[in-house]
Interface confidence: low
């Protein structure tokens, strides 16, 4: 979002006394930030602290296990995607504090706000890969026993990252800085050069590929998995399945406002009251989507505590227990293990 295609947040309320000696603005109240922006700043601050520390810890825990545990590969890649996105937060935070002034240059404008979209695509593609893995473990256990290996997992992750980069290119290409000096400031946003059709196309592609299609396919996927699990009387699903379902659900919950407002803004006339309202909520929607970047470590810790009964272990060992659990394939009465995942404790079903 944050486009000036011209669909910026209200960029006309920042007075940068350092760059130009303007006469006193009439509307002095506009020096204060709007409530949605203040909320966005609070969310950004929390997400940055939890996201950087949490994901760094997840990376540290899973990196050592990634050679031998496929689940660790999945969680490692998710954590890297989230960690990368969190690195942009201090810059985005600073920009909002300065009423959306962007003093960081054109390259930063193209790259940093695009990181959250890269995260969105990388996360959903990785989650789709993980979900396919869970699906195969349940419905094709013999195939998994023969072919499910770390090498294939890394290839799948590389494909997911490659596709994510490709899908982020439109946002990256249309991001530009624009100077405004009443009040003096540099704006960073998306410029579709008044081409509403192009803007709509980007918004639709983002909604379909980054939200609706994954929502549909993953819902079907997990419906089948859960039905099979329950039909086999495996009422206690493994930690990994519960954790993955929680991660998938949180993805859709936290991206929903961004996607809804994005598609609405692309179809609304920029002069309409609804559009102007949505514009003001833009930063808040972005910050809400950013919660995805810190929620996974929280899910892992909550899951770990749930499985441990109470938090007896250290945080790293608790995370290790959740993130590096071996996938034990159960089909009929036989238990078979992945040839790669050989060092795990036995846990029931899926």
């Amino acid at each position: 979002m944050d486009s000036f295609n011209y669909t910026t947040p209200d960029y006309g309320h920042y007075d940068d006394k350092d760059t130009l000696d303007l006469n006193t603005p009439v509307d002095k109240t506009s020096n204060t930030l709007r409530v949605p922006d203040i909320l966005a700043l609070v969310i950004f601050a929390v997400v940055f602290l939890v996201g950087v520390l949490g994901n760094a810890l997840v990376v540290w825990v899973t990196a050592f296990e990634a050679k031998r545990t496929i689940n660790a590969i999945w969680f490692l890649n998710l954590a890297v995607a989230d960690f990368l996105s969190c690195l942009a937060l201090p810059i985005l935070f600073t920009s909002i504090v300065q009423h959306h002034h962007w003093p960081f240059g054109g390259a930063a404008c193209s790259i940093l706000p695009s990181l959250i979209l890269l995260n969105m695509y990388a996360s959903i593609l990785l989650l789709a890969t993980i979900s396919a893995d869970r699906f195969l473990l349940v419905f094709k256990p013999i195939w998994c026993q023969n072919f499910r290996g770390a090498g294939l997992a890394w290839i799948a992750c590389a494909v997911a990252w490659g596709l994510a980069l490709l899908l982020t290119i439109p946002s990256f290409l249309y991001r530009v800085v624009r100077e405004e000096y009443f009040p003096p400031k540099v704006l960073c946003g998306v410029d579709y050069s008044h081409d509403k059709r192009r803007e709509r196309a980007v918004a639709i592609v983002r909604l379909v590929l980054g939200f609706l299609w994954p929502l549909l396919t993953l819902t079907i996927c997990y419906t089948f998995i859960l039905l099979r699990t329950w039909s086999r009387r495996a009422t206690r699903s493994t930690k990994t399945l519960k954790v993955v379902v929680a991660v998938v659900a949180s993805f859709f919950i936290f991206w929903l406002p961004y996607q809804v407002t994005g598609i609405m803004m692309s179809f609304l006339e920029p002069s309409s009251p609804t559009f102007l309202l949505l514009k003001k909520l833009d930063s808040l929607c972005v910050s809400f989507a950013y919660i995805n970047c810190c929620i996974n470590p929280i899910i892992y810790v909550v899951a770990g505590q749930g499985f441990q009964g109470r938090l007896r272990k250290s945080l790293p060992s608790l995370l290790r227990n959740v993130l590096t659990e071996e996938s034990v394939v159960r089909e009929s009465k036989s238990f078979t293990r992945s040839t790669v995942d050989t060092m795990a404790q036995k846990t029931q079903a899926v």
Epitope: H13, T19, E180
Partner: antibody
Framework: EVQLKQSGGGLVKPGGSLKLSCAAS????????MSWVRQTPEKRLEWVAT????????YYPDSVKGRFTISRDNAKNTLYLQMSSLKSEDTAMYYC????????????WGQGTSVTVSS | DVVMTQSPLTLSVTIGQPASISCKSS???????????LNWLLQRPGQSPKRLIY???KLDSGVPDRFTGSGSGTDFTLKISRVEAEDLGVYYC?????????FGGGTKLEIK
């Protein structure tokens, strides 16, 4: 196509008031800083007022400060200039201009509306 | 305020001949970001002004390439390589570096 259509000019007595309007089309009005510029009978151009894209900030030269008020209605894509306590030296052709970034400041001009202050 | 001084006041040129207009500012127009916000406008008879050039030398879309802008600091020039009938009117320079915007007095281009 960017268009700025002006209305509201006319003859007014000294001390009187007048409101000029400028209807914008062909661009996203709410994203641009907008200005009023006047051209005196001697053909000199003079900046009169500027308003930020969201309408929060307004700027005036000392010659009109306290007498002129620039405003905008982004929902209606319209820019306004309320002129009060008019003086004879305010007699001019008034133009509304589009100005956002420095590079596109005053890149498009309205057709102009004549204001004559005379007793 | 920054004073913009244009010369000459009137310029009489034969069609097909070159023309040059000068604009001097009382202060440097180089902004802190390294850009110089000097624009040229043309006001044809009975019309509103139209911007021709921005950032000293960048031509607006639809402006013929016979127009060129140059200069830096406080001295700027607008050149027309071959004057055509449609070029007649009053040319104004305007600066946007310092608050407020200020305009030159104008140079009237006449056809001989």
């Amino acid at each position: 196509e960017v268009q700025l259509k002006q209305s509201g000019g006319g003859l007014v007595k000294p001390g009187g008031s007048l409101k000029l309007s400028c209807a914008a089309s062909g661009f996203t009005f709410s994203s641009y800083t907008m200005s009023w510029v006047r051209q005196t009978p001697e053909k000199r151009l003079e900046w009169v007022a500027t308003i930020s894209s969201g309408g929060s900030y307004t700027y005036y030269p000392d010659s009109v400060k306290g007498r002129f008020t620039i405003s905008r209605d982004n929902a209606k894509n319209t820019l306004y200039l309320q002129m009060s306590s008019l003086k004879s030296e305010d007699t001019a052709m008034y133009y509304c201009t589009r100005g956002g970034g420095n590079y596109d400041a005053m890149d498009y001009w309205g057709q102009g509306t004549s204001v004559t202050v005379s007793s | 305020d920054v004073v913009m001084t244009q010369s000459p006041l009137t310029l009489s040129v034969t069609i097909g001949q070159p023309a040059s207009i000068s604009c001097k500012s009382s202060q440097s127009l180089l902004y802190s970001n390294g850009k110089t916000y000097l624009n040229w406008l043309l006001q044809r008879p009975g019309q509103s002004p139209k911007r021709l050039i921005y950032l000293v030398s960048k031509l607006d879309s639809g402006v013929p390439d016979r127009f060129t802008g140059s200069g830096s600091g406080t001295d700027f020039t607008l050149k027309i390589s071959r004057v055509e009938a449609e070029d007649l009117g009053v040319y104004y320079c305007v600066q946007g570096t310092h608050f407020p915007h200020t305009f030159g007095g104008g140079t009237k281009l006449e056809i001989k």
